[in-house]
Interface confidence: low
């Protein structure tokens, strides 16, 4: 609720490139950059291969002309080019940018992957996709790590054990391990391939998880988190194949025997939804381990409108499933297509995500934000992020999302999609987000049988109302301009009954009162007014409900001439509640007690006349 | 936006003064104005910050007893008075504003005023 | 509060060259993936200018042989090639913190 779609940083790349079919938030040394794939582009550091994709570096500050550059991989430029002893390289259409990740530390390196890398040592026989990752440096510059995790030497088969892995396709970054999905290992059984940089060695899968499992794909999707301990690192692999109906399995990373084991596994519910096909691992309710999002992005109630699954973790990697989301569940949609974690975009102390829909809107895309909160994701979204409402040349907006940094600045980490079939990315900012606590002071009870005011003709039934406000939040102005409407006897209102008080200001009567307040930084500023009760109320029984409603009045966003301008900034989401506050009081009863039970005898006689 | 400050001020030991910052070309409501000393050949030190809608203060704590902060809305001026002047207070103040928000840098300076302390 | 420690304390460089200015902090001015340390240039007789903020952006109208770098607790403000009209103090600040505190000035 708290992106500012209105003010879009946009990104252009090459035409018919992909450019913004995987995306990346990056920052290093205070330099912040989006990352761009583009895994159709030609590259201009290997002229004579044909489209190998490129990754794209576009600086966010002091760029006004939003100018994106490749990042040169010192990747030679010729055809053959040796890479082992039975290893010669074919770059032509590698995808290279297909996937990108980033180490989670200050310094984090950049892992980029072209799963369609081929290895043609063997050409005669064989062509094979082993797929090629590229670790890059914090900084950005040449030179960086070669992984060709599916290479092995003297093996030429192309369906057999890792022949056509096709590694990279999804790729995740730990500070530890380098994780990448290759999903055509074993004849499309597929893998994880999984290195642990700290020594240098990948962690096995057990090949008997998956020799029997053609065609699963796992490894479509990776992610790694904390599922069974706060300080351990386990990892996740879909499989949008398995059984027609996808699954997901969670592997922990044995350093000892250096092997991955499976500790869970969920399964889709319809053929070819494509379960699994997305991932993401986040802590949603903050209590240190991470839950899990699995997307399946073409489950159909009519066409593909897409579904997400969230399980919420219990501990020991025992996670459950909470709910499915469907965003707006529009027709051939593919929600959850792409699914990233946010970090906490509204700064109320839990993680948030986006989810996204690229074919919606006929391939215009949409992407939604949910939030965390402690009982896990809170059902409803916050906000629907349109790409044609953003910019109507957007096409498939949505299939990648990057979060997690704040990119402007302003204490609020920011969001980036990418929208490939249109060659664009689009950074969008996130606002400051406002807190507004509200206060109705009334009294305990009415009396109405001693009338304290005066209402010009004659004495009246009446009680003091006050109203207090305060602000906080991070980074937000010194001073901001509230409007509030302040409704006396609102359930009556709502059910279209008059209401049984009235306010009364400089003698005019009113059901409500409108005002606008200056409100300072964590200081309360409060109102006081008096209400009368109507005469001859007859419910004297049903609570009286006071309702303050309050909305930000027009902010003043100071200098427009800045690059990135302040944002205005926003009031918290009441999750999807209306943004007010109520308080009741009761008309007093009178009793000894409050709890005011009849003591009522009724006795009954029969008179019968005679006709 | 321009911050102007009050010119050079000769004051004697034990006495007070007060330096002022007139704002102008936004809303001064919504920024807090920040002053720092420069002592003779020295570096700078930030002293505190005021919220001209609230009057709300903040200091380093060895200020905390030298130094008033008030505001005037009407002429939108920020004043610092300085108590119990010894030569240690002699150096240039001067005003200054945030960028934006509370956490950014200081993007504008009045011209600064020399106090000298001399008897 | 955090202390920032500059070095050199002064420095000559000859016209064209590089001039290096480096500040280390106490402890950590990082924040959510933001550097709250600022650079600015002081000339005689006039108040002090930003330069860089956040760590390594340009303020606009800056000219661009000034750079900044580094996270955490090590930075460095580069001028490359150094003109004349560069003969000035420079002195680094941190907000991550309060109070805020400006480094002793090159």
């Known amino acids: 609720y708290n992106l500012d779609p209105q003010r879009p940083v946009h990104f252009q790349g090459p035409a018919d490139s992909f450019f913004g079919y995987a995306v990346l938030e990056h920052f290093h040394d205070n330099t912040r950059w989006v990352l761009v794939g583009a895994p159709k582009a030609d590259s201009k550091y290997s002229p004579s291969v044909k489209s190998p994709g490129a990754v794209f570096k576009c600086r966010v500050h002091t760029n006004p002309d939003r100018r994106c550059t490749e990042l040169d991989m010192a990747r030679g430029k010729n055809r053959g080019t040796s890479c082992g002893k039975t290893c010669r390289e074919d770059r032509d259409d590698e995808w290279m940018g297909v996937s990108l990740a980033r180490q989670p530390k200050a310094d984090g390196r950049v892992l980029a992957c072209a799963h369609r890398w081929k290895n043609i040592y063997y050409e005669a026989d064989h062509i094979l996709p082993h797929g090629f990752c590229y670790i890059i440096p914090s900084n950005l510059q040449a030179k960086g790590r070669t992984l060709i995790p599916c290479y092995e030497e003297y093996k030429k088969k192309y369906g057999e054990e890792h022949g056509s892995c096709q590694a990279g396709i999804a790729g995740f970054f730990t500070e530890e391990l380098v994780v990448m999905g290759a999903p055509g290992s074993f004849y499309w059984a597929g893998t994880i391939k999984v290195l642990n940089l700290t020594d240098n060695t990948y962690l096995k899968l057990n090949d008997e998880v998956i020799m029997n499992r053609r065609y699963t794909y796992l490894g479509y999707a990776v992610t790694a988190g904390h599922f069974s301990h706060p300080s351990t690192i386990d990892v996740v692999g879909g499989a949008p194949q398995d059984k027609g109906i996808g699954k997901v399995y969670i592997f922990r990373a044995d350093r000892r025997s250096g092997t991955l084991i499976k500790i869970f596994q969920a399964s889709g519910k319809k053929m070819g939804s494509y379960f699994g096909s997305s991932l993401c691992a986040v802590d949603l309710n903050g209590d240190g381990l991470s839950d899990l999002l699995v997307g399946a992005p073409m489950f159909s109630e009519i066409r593909d409108e897409g579904q997400v699954t969230v399980y919420i973790n219990r501990g020991n990697g025992a996670l459950e499933e909470q709910l499915a989301l469907t965003g707006d569940g529009a027709y051939n949609a593919h929600f959850g297509e792409s699914i990233a974690s946010l970090d906490d975009l509204d700064n109320d102390g839990f993680p948030d995500v986006a989810i996204g829909a690229p074919k919606e809107d006929d391939f215009a895309g949409a992407v939604y934000i949910y939030h965390g909160d402690a009982g896990g994701i809170v059902p409803q979204y916050s906000m629907k992020l349109s790409g044609q409402k953003i910019n109507p040349v957007l096409r498939m907006f949505g299939q990648s999302i990057s979060g997690g940094i704040d990119m402007d600045g302003n204490g609020y980490p920011d969001v980036t999609v990418g929208a490939f079939m249109s060659d664009s990315v689009v950074l969008l900012r996130a606002r400051p987000v406002i807190t507004v606590d509200v206060s109705i002071f009334l009294p305990g009870s009415i009396n109405i049988t001693a009338p304290q005011c005066h209402d010009g003709q004659q004495p009246v039934n009446c009680l003091n109302v006050t109203t207090c406000f305060s602000f906080h939040g991070k980074h937000v102005p010194g001073e901001i301009g509230l409007n509030y409407v302040l409704m006396a006897d609102v359930a009556k209102k709502e059910k279209g009954q008059m209401p049984r008080v009235y306010f009364v200001l400089l003698g005019e009567t009113m059901g409500q009162v409108t005002e606008k307040l200056q409100l300072t930084y964590m200081e309360e500023t409060c109102r006081h007014y008096v209400a009368h009760v109507k005469r001859r109320v007859q419910d004297v029984i049903s609570p009286i409900v006071f309702e303050a409603a309050y909305s930000l009045s027009e902010h003043v966003t100071g200098e427009e001439e800045r690059e990135l301008p302040p944002l205005t900034p926003v009031l918290r989401w009441k999750k999807g509640q209306k943004i007010a506050q109520k308080n009741q009081t009761v008309f007093e009863r009178n009793c000894r007690s409050e709890d005011c039970a009849a003591d009522l005898q009724l006795q009954g006689k029969l008179l019968l006349s005679s006709m | 936006v321009k911050l102007q400050e009050s010119g050079t001020k000769l004051v004697k030991p034990g006495a007070s003064v007060r330096l002022s910052c007139k704002a102008s070309g936004y809303t001064f409501t919504s920024y807090w104005i920040h002053w720092v000393k420069q002592s003779p050949g020295q570096g700078l030190e930030w002293i505190g910050e005021i919220n001209p809608s609230s009057g709300r203060t903040n200091f380093i704590e060895n200020f905390e007893t030298k130094a008033t902060l008030t505001v005037d809305r009407s002429s939108t001026t920020a004043y610092m008075q300085l108590t119990s002047l010894t030569s240690e207070d002699s150096a240039v103040y001067y005003c200054?504003?945030?960028?934006?928000?509370?956490?950014?840098?200081?993007?504008?300076w009045g011209q600064g005023t020399t106090v000298t302390v001399s008897s | 509060q955090i202390v920032l420690t500059q070095s050199p304390a002064s420095l000559a460089v000859s016209l064209g060259q590089r001039a290096t200015i480096s500040c280390r902090a106490s402890e950590t001015v990082d924040s959510y993936g933001n550097t709250f340390m600022h650079w600015y240039q002081q000339k005689p007789g006039q108040p002090p200018k930003l330069l860089i903020y956040l760590a390594s952006n340009l303020e606009s109208g800056v000219p661009v042989r000034f750079s900044g770098s580094g996270s955490r607790t090590d930075f460095t403000l580069t001028i490359d090639p150094v003109e004349a009209d560069d003969a000035a103090t420079y002195y680094c600040?941190?907000?991550?913190?309060?109070?805020?505190?400006f480094g002793g000035g090159t």
């Open positions: 600040q941190q907000n991550n913190e309060d109070p805020y505190t």
């Open positions: 200054a504003r945030l960028a934006y928000g509370n956490y950014s840098w200081f993007a504008y």
